[in-house]
């Protein structure tokens, strides 16, 4: 399934275990954390990523929403339960039994309950802004030449059709690229711009998922785009139900 | 050819631990993933976890956690199973099997807990 | 959970078998597009013999009248012209995630 036969290791997964254990020793990889097997010719779905990286350390901070809707992911890591595909089961529950509703990405988007919390659906994301601030350069980026490279980036590195970047926007020295799939928009076969979005993610802080690649090497016309801070927001089909009072959605901010 | 050899049968005490063995050889250890399975008679076949030599990847099923520690040694090619705080729950043959398609298996350790 | 059915079955030589398997949960990878679904023979006083993985490979020195079928929740093991020495309990056991179970068998006994 892609995976590199040779040495037996999936191109665009680090976080697997490959072994040439399938058919007449075909190699296969499978999810660490998980053991679900992975299409290593494709990206593997943040859930079993973050199932993946469950060990890893939190990081949360707080800042202005764009949108009194919009959610980032405050909550930072956890260690996800995942359906048979390999999606985020809607509602999520830690070890002492509190439980809570995500989104398509993951994100918290109920407050927090007990077992007796119900989450009726996975509530698709289907509206994804990342904000970049860039570090200092002799002259602003040509505004085309930048949204060029950042559509091949996610063209090509991270396999995503063309026809979910609606927009990247640039007033130095922000950077906003707007990522729009609707369920109907998404076909089989296409990446999900949730998974899309967290390899981009992980590529910006200097911890590429991508096997034996070096890290994100972004440049436009040949001048390197140095990104020195990331903020996702989430936008879902169906707005998150918090009660009242509560100011402040999930964050989950990346601080490079 | 691929080869499990399993350590000899144990008889032991409630309450006390056991460790068996399980020898590969006939292919490259440290790359495929090796499992360890609980049969008792009348409860079919029950996985317990599985260890990944290449990289000390370990993964338990719940019913086992606390019960079933897997480790294993690369330089002799073999995988441990250390079961503790034995009951008569326990008795049972336990196989080490190598993962994936030609799933061999290694002839089973018998082990009766009774005091 | 992997149900299994019947629990055991008496034939006669030369007979076809259908072994049921059904698990709750799809065995379909959508991205591999691979069942994982393995079947095993055991024979009393030995260990289990891989027959068939991805519910329908058939393992290398495995008879060609043992055929693996089905696919998401349901699958079946097919023993054509049953012989004396395919007496043994057959066990279905999926590795699509942790922790990997097995059904609780099917005897096969030959009148």
């Known amino acids: 399934h892609t995976a590199a036969q040779d040495n037996c290791t999936c191109p665009t997964n680090k976080m697997t275990v490959c072994s040439p254990d399938g058919p007449g020793g075909r190699c296969q990889c499978r999810a660490l954390g998980s053991g679900v097997a992975v299409d290593c010719s494709t990206l593997t779905s943040k859930c079993l990523l973050l199932k993946a990286r469950m060990s890893a350390p939190k990081n949360a901070r707080t800042l202005v929403r764009p949108n009194e809707h919009a959610l980032v992911d405050n909550d930072g890591l956890y260690d996800p339960d995942c359906d048979p595909e390999g999606r985020f089961k809607a509602r999520q529950c830690n070890q002492t039994s509190v439980c809570w509703c995500v989104n398509s990405v993951g994100v918290r988007r109920t407050d927090k309950g007990d077992l007796s919390l119900r989450c009726d659906e996975l509530v698709r994301t289907h509206h994804i802004l990342i904000d970049l601030r860039h570090r200092p350069t002799a002259g602003a980026f040509n505004h085309s030449d930048l949204d060029a490279e950042l559509r091949r980036l996610f063209r090509e590195r991270y396999r995503l059709h063309p026809k979910f970047v609606a927009a990247v926007h640039y007033e130095q020295p922000t950077i906003q690229i707007e990522l729009r799939q609707n369920t109907s928009q998404k076909a089989a076969g296409d990446v999900d711009i949730g998974d899309a979005a967290y390899y981009f993610e992980r590529d910006v802080k200097g911890e590429s998922l991508f096997q034996g690649r070096g890290g994100l090497d972004l440049r436009v016309r040949g001048e390197p785009l140095q990104v020195e801070r990331t903020l996702i927001y989430y936008l879902d089909e169906i707005p998150p139900k918090f009660s009242m009072k509560r100011h402040h959605h999930h964050h989950h901010h990346h601080h490079h | 050819q691929v080869q499990l050899q399993q350590s000899g049968p144990e008889l032991v005490r409630p309450g006390t631990s056991v460790k068996m063995s399980c020898k590969a050889a006939?292919?490259?250890?440290?790359?495929?993933?090796i499992g360890w399975v609980k049969q008792r008679p009348g409860h079919g076949l029950e996985w317990i976890g599985n260890?990944?030599?290449?990289?000390?990847?370990?993964n338990y099923n719940e019913n086992f956690k606390g019960k079933a520690t897997l480790t294993a040694d690369t330089f002799s090619s073999t995988a441990y199973m250390q079961l503790n705080s034995l009951t008569s729950a326990d008795s049972a043959i336990y196989y080490c099997?190598?993962?994936?398609?030609?799933?061999?298996w290694g002839q089973g350790t018998t082990l009766t807990v009774s005091s | 959970v992997m149900t299994q059915s019947p629990s055991s079955l008496t034939v006669t030589a030369g007979e076809k078998v259908t072994l049921s398997c059904k698990c709750s949960?799809?065995?379909?990878?959508?991205?591999?597009?691979?069942?994982?679904l393995t079947w095993y023979q055991q024979k009393p006083g030995q260990p289990p013999k891989m027959l068939i993985y991805?519910?329908?490979i058939r393992e290398p020195g495995v008879p060609d009248r043992f055929t693996g079928s089905g696919s998401g929740t349901d699958f079946t093991l097919t023993i054509n012209n049953v012989q004396a020495e395919d007496l043994a309990v057959y066990y279905c056991?999926?590795?699509?995630?942790?922790?990997?179970?097995f059904g609780s068998g099917t005897k096969l006994e030959i009148k």
């Open positions: 099997a190598r993962e994936g398609s030609s799933g061999y």
């Open positions: 006939g292919y490259t250890f440290t790359k495929f993933w």
């Open positions: 260890i990944y030599p290449g990289g000390a990847y370990i």
């Open positions: 949960q799809s065995l379909l990878n959508s991205g591999t597009q691979e069942n994982y």
């Open positions: 991805w519910a329908s």
């Open positions: 056991q999926h590795d699509y995630s942790y922790p990997f179970t």
